[in-house]
C-alpha cells in the first residue's frame, strides 16, 4: 500500500472505530478487504475491553504497552508492531496485509531471522575458508589457529611458530628441534628429557620391559639377564631367553594309581574321613615302596582325637603305635622293607588284637582290650591321614618320629572300602602321582632347594672352620648350583655349580666365592648313566680338590683374597643350600640356575638326609631318583 492510501485508511480508522465504536462491517469498509479485517477486528475488541469503562481484565495485560485506546487500536494494523522479527538477526521489518516480512542481517536466516547460518559448515566454502580452526558465532564466524601457530593478516591462514628461535634456552641442556606446531627437546639414545630439570636423564629401560626376564640398568643403557632358577639362559639377541636344555632325559612317567607320599615336605598328602556302620573295624591294606628309612605311612584317629593309630617306618621296618581309652602301645617288627621293592602291607583290627602282615605273612600281633575306635550310636567315625600328622602330635606319640616319608602306595583298601575316596582325589592331581620306576638317591627337579643349618666350626682344629664335601651326582641338565653357602647379608661366599661347557656335550664344575670363579674343572662328561664323584676340602688357607681332575684356577694371590672373603663370612652365620640358591641378587653368583638331577651330599662326614632339612621344596625327592630314560625302538 502507498503512503497516501495508508494515511486515508488511518483517518477512516480514527473516525470509524476510535471516535466511535465500529462493528466488523464498518471495519471492513475501512480496510476494504477481508484478510486485514479478519486480522484487525478480534484485536480491536481486545483493545475495547481493556480501555472501555475503565475495566481491568485479564485481556488488559496484552495491551499494557498502550496508554490509551487510540494508541492500542492504531497499532493493530501494523504487522511489525510488536516486532515479530528476532532482534539480533533482523535488519528491517516490512508491514503487509495481515502479514510482515523480516529482512535479515548477513549470517542470519529464517522467516523471523531467528536462525544463525553456520558458515563453518558451508559446503561451498569448506571450513569457512579457515586453514585450521573455524569458530561459528551468532550471525558470524571467525578463524583461529592451533597451539604453536600464529594467524596471518588475512585472518584465515596459520603459520608455524619456531619456538627454538624464539626462546633459545627452551630445552636447557638438551637439543631443541622445531616441529609443526610444537618443538621437541632431543636427548642422546638411552636418555629421556626431564621437563622440570630441563635436562637429559637416563632412561630406565628395565621399567619398559626391554628384557624378556631380568634386567640391569646403567647410564645410557641396560643389560638383560635370564632367570637361571626358572631354567633359562640369555639368547643371541641379548634380550630374550632360552631354556637350559636337558642333557640326560629321565623317566618321569607317573601313574595315578600310585599315591606319592612325599608330595608335601611338611604336612599330610591325603586326608580321608570315614563314617561307617560299626561292623567296619579299622583295616588298611596297601602295597608300599620306598628307599626311605623313617616316616609316617598313615595316621588314623577318632573324630575327637582321643584314640589314634600310627603306621610308620623306622629303621626300614614297620612300626605301629596306638593309643585309646584302654591302652597305649608301640611295636616295631618284620623285615626291612625300604628296599625299593613293592611290599604288601596289611593292618587289620581283629576282635582282640591288631594284626600286621607283610606279603600276607603275619609279622606282628598287638593285643588290645577293646575296639580301637569307639562307635557312636552304631557308626564308626574315623579320620585317616597319609604321610603326616594333622597337627602337632609329637607330644602325644609314644616315641617321636620324623614324619617325612618319600615313598609310594598302591592297591590300597582302607576300611574295606577298596580304592574309594583315594582314587577320586589323586586322579585329578598330578603331583600326588608316583613315579613308575625309581632308584636310590635324592632327586632335584630343577625347581627348588633344600636348606640345612650346619656348624662348620671345629673347636679342636687350629684352622677353625672347615668344609669337607663329597658329591655323588648324575645331572640331568648341564647348568645349576649344586651346593651353596649363603650369609645373612644375602651374599654367596661359597658355591659349587655345574655349567654347560663350551665344548659340546660336556660340563664344567665351577667353584666360586661370591661372583668370582676360583676353580673350574673343565669338560667333564657328567650327563651319563654313571654317577660322578667329586670330593674337596676347604678351610681359610686352602681349597684342595681330592678328585683327580683337570682344573683351571686363579692366581695364588687372588685365591688368598677370595679365601679371606670366605673366611670372613664363615665367622658369621651361613646357611647351607642344596640344589640352588634362595632369593639372592642374580648377580651374586656366576650361576643361579637350580640343579636338575640326582645328587647325594656328604658334609664333614655326615650324609645329608633331606628329610632332616630345615626346609625343602616339595618337588625335591629325598630318597628316590627317577631312572634314566631308556630309548625304545618306537621312541
Amino acid at each position: 500500500a502507498n503512503s497516501m492510501l495508508e494515511e486515508t485508511k488511518q483517518g477512516n480508522l480514527e473516525r470509524e472505530c476510535i471516535e466511535e465504536l465500529c462493528n466488523k462491517e464498518e471495519a471492513r469498509e475501512v480496510f476494504e478487504n477481508d484478510p486485514e479485517t479478519d486480522y484487525f477486528y478480534p484485536k480491536y475488541l481486545v483493545c475495547l475491553r481493556s480501555f472501555q469503562s475503565g475495566l481491568f481484565t485479564a485481556a488488559r495485560q496484552s495491551t499494557d504497552a498502550y496508554p490509551d485506546l487510540r494508541s492500542c487500536v492504531n497499532a493493530i494494523p501494523d504487522q511489525c508492531s510488536p516486532l515479530p522479527c528476532n532482534e539480533d538477526g533482523y535488519m528491517s521489518c516490512k508491514d503487509g496485509k495481515a502479514s510482515f516480512t523480516c529482512t535479515c542481517k548477513p549470517g542470519w536466516q529464517g522467516e523471523k531471522c531467528e536462525f544463525d547460518i553456520n558458515e563453518c559448515k558451508d559446503p561451498s566454502n569448506i571450513n569457512g575458508g579457515c586453514s585450521q580452526i573455524c569458530d561459528n558465532t551468532p550471525g558470524s564466524y571467525h578463524c583461529s589457529c592451533k597451539s604453536g601457530f600464529v594467524m596471518l593478516s588475512n585472518k584465515k591462514d596459520c603459520k608455524d611458530v619456531d619456538e627454538c628461535s624464539l626462546k633459545p634456552n627452551m630445552c636447557g641442556t638438551a637439543v631443541c628441534k622445531n616441529i609443526p606446531g610444537d618443538f621437541e627437546c632431543e636427548c642422546p639414545e638411552g636418555y629421556r628429557y626431564n621437563l622440570k630439570s630441563k635436562s637429559c636423564e637416563d632412561v630406565d629401560e628395565c621399567s619398559e620391559n626391554m628384557c624378556a626376564q631380568l634386567c640391569v640398568n646403567y647410564p645410557g643403557g641396560y643389560t638383560c639377564y635370564c632367570d637361571g632358577k626358572k631354567g633359562f639362559k640369555l639368547a643371541q639377541d641379548q634380550k630374550s631367553c632360552e631354556a637350559v636344555s636337558v642333557c640326560l632325559p629321565l623317566n618321569l612317567d607317573t601313574k595315578y594309581e600310585l599315591l606319592y607320599l612325599a608330595e608335601q615336605f611338611a604336612g599330610v598328602v591325603l586326608y580321608l574321613k570315614f563314617r561307617l556302620p560299626e561292623i567296619s573295624r579299622f583295616s588298611a591294606e596297601f602295597d608300599f615302596r620306598t628307599y626311605d628309612s623313617q616316616g609316617v605311612i598313615l595316621y588314623a584317629e577318632s573324630i575327637d582325637h582321643s584314640a589314634w593309630l600310627l603306621i610308620a617306618l623306622r629303621g626300614g621296618k614297620i612300626e605301629v603305635q596306638l593309643k585309646n581309652e584302654h591302652t597305649s602301645k608301640i611295636t616295631t617288627g618284620g623285615d626291612i622293607i625300604n628296599n625299593g621293592l613293592w611290599n604288601m602291607v596289611s593292618v587289620e583290627e581283629l576282635e582282640h588284637s591288631i594284626s600286621i602282615k607283610i606279603a600276607k605273612e603275619a609279622v606282628m600281633d598287638i593285643n588290645k582290650p577293646g575296639p580301637l575306635f569307639k562307635p557312636e550310636n552304631g557308626l564308626l567315625e574315623t579320620k585317616v591321614y597319609f604321610a603326616g600328622f594333622p597337627r602337632k602330635v609329637e607330644s602325644e606319640l609314644i616315641k617321636p618320629i620324623n614324619p617325612r616319608l618319600d615313598g609310594c602306595i598302591r592297591s590300597w583298601n582302607l576300611m574295606k572300602q577298596g580304592a574309594s575316596g583315594i582314587k577320586e582325589i589323586i586322579q585329578e592331581k598330578q603331583n600326588k602321582h608316583c613315579l613308575v620306576t625309581v632308584e636310590k638317591g635324592s632327586y632335584y627337579p630343577g625347581s627348588g632347594i633344600a636348606e640345612f643349618h650346619i656348624d662348620y666350626n671345629n673347636g679342636s682344629n687350629a684352622e677353625g672352620w672347615h668344609i669337607n664335601v663329597t658329591l655323588n651326582i648324575r645331572p640331568s641338565m648341564g647348568t645349576g648350583v649344586m651346593l651353596a653357602l649363603v650369609s645373612s647379608n644375602n651374599t654367596v661366599p661359597f658355591a659349587v655349580s655345574l655349567v654347560d661347557s663350551t665344548s659340546e656335550k660336556s660340563q664344567d664344575i665351577v667353584i666360586s666365592v661370591e661372583n668370582t670363579v676360583i676353580y673350574r674343572i673343565q669338560a667333564l662328561s657328567l650327563c651319563s648313566n654313571q654317577r660322578s664323584h667329586l670330593e674337596f676340602r676347604v678351610n681359610r688357607n686352602n681349597l684342595e680338590l681330592l678328585t683327580p681332575l683337570k682344573i683351571e684356577t686363579i692366581s695364588q694371590e687372588e685365591l688368598q683374597t677370595q679365601l679371606a672373603i670366605l673366611d670372613k663370612a664363615m665367622k658369621g652365620k651361613v646357611a647351607t643350600y642344596l640344589g640352588g640358591l634362595p632369593d639372592v641378587p642374580f648377580s651374586a653368583t656366576p650361576v643361579n640356575a637350580f640343579y636338575n638331577g640326582c645328587m647325594e651330599v656328604n658334609i664333614n662326614g655326615v650324609e645329608l638326609d633331606l628329610d632332616e632339612a630345615i626346609s625343602k621344596h616339595n618337588d625335591i625327592r629325598a630318597h628316590s631318583c627317577p631312572s634314566v630314560w631308556k630309548k625304545t625302538k618306537n621312541s
Epitope: 574321613k273 561307617l276 556302620p277 552304631g378 557308626l379 574295606k416 572300602q417 574309594s420 575316596g421 577320586e424
Partner: antibody, heavy 121, light 109 residues
Framework: QVQLVQSGAEVKKPGASVKVSCKSS????????MHWVRQAPGQGLEWMGW????????NYAQKFQGRVTMTRDTSISTAYMEMSRLRSDDTAVYYC??????????????WGQGTLVTVSS | QAVVTQESALTTSPGETVTLTCRSS?????????ANWVQEKPDHLFTGLIG???NRAPGVPARFSGSLIGDKAALTITGAQTEDEAIYFC?????????FGGGTKLTVL
C-alpha cells in the same frame, strides 16, 4: 550328574519274589552306601536296609530279615533288592537312595524315581 | 522300635521363615541320630535336603538349614518359596537302622 534309575513297575502274586534294580551313574559306584526305602499307598517311608557296593556287606531292618536280599553288580554299577514270600501289604513304591558323601554313611542325598510293586492275587 | 513324630501339616507364606521339627520317642534327638530331611514332591519325587543334622546335600539351596532345637531335630526354610510346597520327611538313625517320621505337609500360600 548323579542319577539313580530304577527298573519298571512289577505285579506279583502273594508268595512270589520280586527283584528291583537301581542303576547308578555320575559317580564312583563303590564309594557310596546304597539304602532301600519303601512307601506303601497312603503311608510314610519305611527304611529297609543298606548295602556297601564295594564289599557287598549288607544290613537289613529287623522287620525284613530273612525276606530281603540286597546285592550289587559293580561291573554295571547296579544295586538290587530282592524280596521273597511277598504279601499284599508289601504293595508299595520301593526306592533306592544313595549317600551324598563318599565313605560317609547315613546321608540320604540322592533318590531313585521309585518302582511300584503290586502284590495281588 | 522308636517312633519319630513330625507336625502333620504347616502353612506359611512366600518369604516367611518356617521351622519343621522331628521328635524321637526314645528321648532327646542328638547329633548321633544323624538326622536326615527328605523332600517329596508330586509324583513320588524324593530329594535329600539335609544329612547328619546340618549338612546340606549337594545342590540344595541355602535357604534350607538343619539344626537341633531343644530335644528335637529341626528343618528351617528361611524365605520360603512357592516351589517349597511339598511333604518333608525326617529320618533318625538308631544304632543299626533309620526310622522315618510320618512327614509334614507344607503349604506355601
Amino acid at each position: 550328574q548323579v542319577q539313580l534309575v530304577q527298573s519298571g513297575a512289577e505285579v506279583k502274586k502273594p508268595g512270589a519274589s520280586v527283584k528291583v534294580s537301581c542303576k547308578s551313574s555320575g559317580h564312583t559306584f563303590t564309594g557310596y552306601y546304597m539304602h532301600w526305602v519303601r512307601q506303601a499307598p497312603g503311608q510314610g517311608l519305611e527304611w529297609m536296609g543298606w548295602i556297601n557296593p564295594n564289599s557287598g556287606d549288607t544290613n537289613y531292618a529287623q522287620k525284613f530279615q530273612g525276606r530281603v536280599t540286597m546285592t550289587r553288580d559293580t561291573s554295571i554299577s547296579t544295586a538290587y533288592m530282592e524280596m521273597s514270600r511277598l504279601r499284599s501289604d508289601d504293595t508299595a513304591v520301593y526306592y533306592c537312595a544313595r549317600d551324598s558323601q563318599i565313605l560317609w554313611f547315613g546321608e540320604l542325598g540322592y533318590w531313585g524315581q521309585g518302582t511300584l510293586v503290586t502284590v495281588s492275587s | 522300635q522308636a517312633v519319630v513324630t513330625q507336625e502333620s501339616a504347616l502353612t506359611t507364606s512366600p518369604g516367611e521363615t518356617v521351622t519343621l521339627t522331628c521328635r524321637s520317642s526314645t528321648g532327646a534327638v542328638t547329633a548321633s541320630n544323624y538326622a536326615n530331611w527328605v523332600q517329596e514332591k508330586p509324583d513320588h519325587l524324593f530329594t535329600g535336603l539335609i544329612g547328619s543334622t546340618n549338612n546340606r546335600a549337594p545342590g540344595v539351596p541355602a535357604r534350607f538349614s538343619g539344626s537341633l532345637i531343644g530335644d528335637k531335630a529341626a528343618l528351617t526354610i528361611t524365605g520360603a518359596q512357592t516351589e517349597d510346597e511339598a511333604i518333608y520327611f525326617c529320618a533318625l538313625w538308631y544304632s543299626d537302622h533309620f526310622v522315618f517320621g510320618g512327614g509334614t505337609k507344607l503349604t506355601v500360600l
